[in-house]
Interface confidence: medium
């Protein structure tokens, strides 16, 4: 699997989408897990409703929510009040029995440009910062990792 990068702004919300083949994964619950190290296990964060037919219902674990459009084939994860410690490698998974298939590998990046709270592009006139209520899900972008970029750089 290629790794897709999703970028969100610190303190705001980030939506991650994981498309999948709805026929191939029919009847399967889904999960969102965090990769612990390059070769470590993927620690479950949140999973869809126990009853597959109710997968469209949003389930929360702390500040992370999951919902599944089983007909359209899109799993959506929302990370609310994004913090620096949320940055890292995650997986969208399709569950069957005790097994899990990886739907998408996701690298979450938490961005923090100090100009983002100023008036648009104008460095010299500070503006009011948007509150979470003003914008429920803020700007997010996704891309594939650049060649040579690694999700787990060597630690010094």
């Amino acid at each position: 699997h290629n790794t897709t990068v999703f970028q969100g702004v610190a303190g705001q919300s980030l939506q991650v989408s994981c498309p999948y083949d709805s026929m191939k994964h029919w009847g399967r619950r889904k999960a969102w897990c965090r990769q612990l190290g390059e070769k470590g296990p993927c620690q479950r964060v949140v999973s869809t409703h126990n009853l597959w037919l109710l997968s469209f219902l949003r389930r929360w674990n702390g500040s992370t929510a999951i919902t599944d459009d089983t007909l359209g084939g899109t799993l959506t994860i929302t990370l609310r009040n994004l913090q620096p410690h949320d940055a890292g490698l995650y997986q969208c998974q399709s569950l069957h029995g005790s097994e899990a298939d990886t739907l998408r590998k996701v690298l979450v990046e938490v961005l923090a440009d100090p100009l983002d709270h100023r008036d648009a592009g104008d460095l010299w006139f500070p503006g009011e910062s948007e509150s979470f209520e003003d914008a429920h899900v803020e700007h997010s972008i996704s891309r594939s990792l650049l060649e040579g970029e690694i999700p787990f750089p060597p630690t010094s």
Epitope: V9, A10, P84, D113, P114, P126, G127, S129, H139, S140
Partner: antibody, heavy 115, light 112 residues
């Protein structure tokens, strides 16, 4: 005229505490995100901590090297930002700047941690 | 962390000549809304850093237009078209895209 004046720097023994104060004037303090940046002699600046505005619930962020030891806070009514430094180490020795990390910088206050 | 490297670490320039300083990041600094979060500072001897360039190529207020910034996602250049005596000091690149914010090691500019 914009002013940021840092005070509270001194010579202190390892393991002790120190509180830095940054008094500001001349700009809309309550809207501005503020940071502490430090610089050891002949080294490049190092970002230490960051506090956002009231509209961002005064969210705080820290460098790993100071997390759990340093606390950044602000008092909008006094246009001041603070850095409470506990369990100081010799490697914390530096000039500490109060700044919005963009256009506003103080002159710095020297913190020396030595036995 | 996002690591910035600068080259050269020291440069000696004749007044009136141009100078270029390069900064390289180990990660892309292209963020949301196509904003590249790379900043350039000059720190004059005994002074606080002062902002020259913000978001890769925007000249900060009061900075002479002989300074210019350019680059891509990971490679950046600060150019001084005609160096003057007041330009002496240490030039730092910095990234404010990800926590922790990080600065480059600096490039010392001296006059010949």
């Amino acid at each position: 005229e914009v002013q940021l004046v840092e005070t509270g720097g001194s010579l202190v023994q390892p393991g002790k505490s120190l509180r830095l104060t940054c008094a500001t004037s001349g700009f809309p303090f309550s809207n501005v995100w503020l940071h502490w940046v430090r610089q050891s002699p002949e080294k490049h600046p190092e970002w230490v901590a960051h506090i956002k505005a009231k509209s961002d619930n005064y969210a705080t962020y820290y460098a790993e090297s100071v997390k759990g030891r340093f606390t950044i806070s602000r008092d909008d009514s006094k246009s001041s930002v603070f850095l409470q430094m506990n369990s100081l180490k010799e490697e914390d020795t530096a000039i500490y700047y109060c700044t919005d990390i963009l256009e506003y910088w103080g002159q710095g206050t020297l913190v020396t941690v030595s036995s | 962390d996002t690591v910035l490297t600068q080259a050269p670490l020291s440069v000696s320039v004749t007044p009136g000549e141009s100078a270029s300083i390069s900064c390289r990041s180990n990660k892309s600094l292209l963020g949301i809304r196509d904003i590249t979060s790379l900043y350039w500072y000059l720190q004059k001897p005994g002074k606080s850093p002062q902002l020259l360039i913000y978001r890769m190529s925007n000249l900060a207020s009061g900075v002479p237009d002989r300074f210019s910034g350019s680059g891509s996602e990971t490679d950046f250049t600060l150019k001084i078209s005609e160096v003057e005596t007041e330009d002496v000091g240490v030039y730092y690149c910095a990234q404010f895209l990800r926590y922790p914010y990080t600065f480059g090691p600096g490039t010392k500019l001296e006059l010949k």
